[in-house]
Amino acid sequence: APTSSSTKKTQLQLEHLLLDLQMILNGINNYKNPKLTRMLTFKFYMPKKATELKHLQCLEEELKPLEEVLNLAQSKNFHLRPRDLISNINVIVLELKGSETTFMCEYADETATIVEFLNRWITFCQSIISTLT
């Protein structure tokens, strides 16, 4: 059974992930981002189901394309380079989902824009955090 300290650690990691995803969303929605139209044409895969930490596998698998799409934006839109930002997210995701079990991600038939993709994972984080508090 999860201890209160492990629950607290999970909550902090989810809050960190949530802030990183919100920061990306704010950066790309910045009115000074001339590449937003272009970025919105890229189609991301969305999870069929995202209710448990193991479902973060679906986010992990889309982090590389996310980095490459973010590379289009001017770096001043973000505090960190996309490479470092995604690397940080990857570390958190790996810790949260764990590596004990290999979960095969199932994707929805419909793809999403970068904004829809980020909003979906932001909602996921908020939902899991609410169950922990």
């Epitope: 272009r38 590389k64 394309p65 490459e68």
Partner: antibody
Framework: QVQLVQSGAEVKKPGASVKVSCKAS????????INWVRQATGQGLEWMGW????????GYAQKFQGRVTMTRNTSINTAYMELSSLRSEDTAVYYC???????????WGQGTLVTVSS | DIQMTQSPSSLSASVGDRVTITCRAS??????LGWYQQKPGKAPKRLIY???TLPSGVPSRFSGSGSGTEFTLTISSLQPEDFATYYC?????????FGQGTQLEIK
């Protein structure tokens, strides 16, 4: 890390067929298209076609239409390119390359030399 | 089908030189162009995507520009490892098409 590992060199007679494989690892195979590109000795790169491993959908360059077939086996993360009715002009190095929308071809296989000779 | 015309077909330059290679598309391809470097006996390597975006790990001396039908690849200060053949690739529509290549040689 992402890797595309292709099958070994082949020597074929004119009129025969060749099937080249491309085994993907280090990423979700169904999330990226597989493209096939060939290069004759001392020549440029020539795009042959693409396949979506998720749906199995394919698209071929007009030049190869009717002679090329691109397939996949998702259970072993492997893509295949079969070229039939081989002629000497098909002697080339054949590459598979991973692609997704406008990101271009970010990872390539090491290449497979196919020699067509009587 | 879209034709890609690359120029020059070959180019001699020295270490430290600034070099520019041009690619022209037969119709508007927006920003859907990539640049690839190939060394003898090796697979091509992606240098630029979406006309001007550098993937992680590609040195900043490489840069791309252009949109529509005219594109350029610039190497700001040639290094010994940059002597290779360069190709442009349009990924705007099917069939995809490459430029004929530019061989960059040591002067």
């Amino acid at each position: 890390q992402v890797q595309l590992v292709q099958s070994g060199a082949e020597v074929k007679k004119p009129g025969a067929s060749v099937k080249v494989s491309c085994k993907a690892s280090g990423y979700t195979f169904t999330n990226y298209d597989i493209n096939w590109v060939r290069q004759a000795t001392g020549q440029g790169l020539e795009w042959m076609g693409w396949m979506n491993p998720n749906s199995g959908n394919t698209g071929y360059a007009q030049k190869f239409q009717g002679r090329v077939t691109m397939t996949r086996n998702t259970s072993i993360n492997t893509a295949y390119m079969e070229l039939s009715s081989l002629r000497s002009e098909d002697t080339a190095v054949y590459y598979c390359a991973r692609g997704r929308q406008w990101l271009g071809f970010d990872y390539w296989g090491q290449g497979t030399l196919v020699t067509v000779s009587s | 089908d879209i034709q890609m015309t690359q120029s020059p077909s070959s180019l001699s330059a020295s270490v430290g030189d600034r070099v520019t290679i041009t690619c022209r598309a037969s119709q508007d391809i927006e920003h859907d162009l990539g640049w690839y470097q190939q060394k003898p006996g090796k697979a091509p390597k992606r240098l630029i995507y979406a006309a001007s975006t550098l993937p992680s790990g590609v040195p900043s001396r490489f840069s791309g520009s252009g949109s529509g039908t005219e594109f350029t690849l610039t190497i700001s200060s040639l290094q010994p490892e940059d002597f290779a053949t360069y190709y442009c690739l349009q990924h705007n529509s099917f069939p995809r098409s490459f430029g004929q290549g530019t061989q960059l040689e040591i002067k």
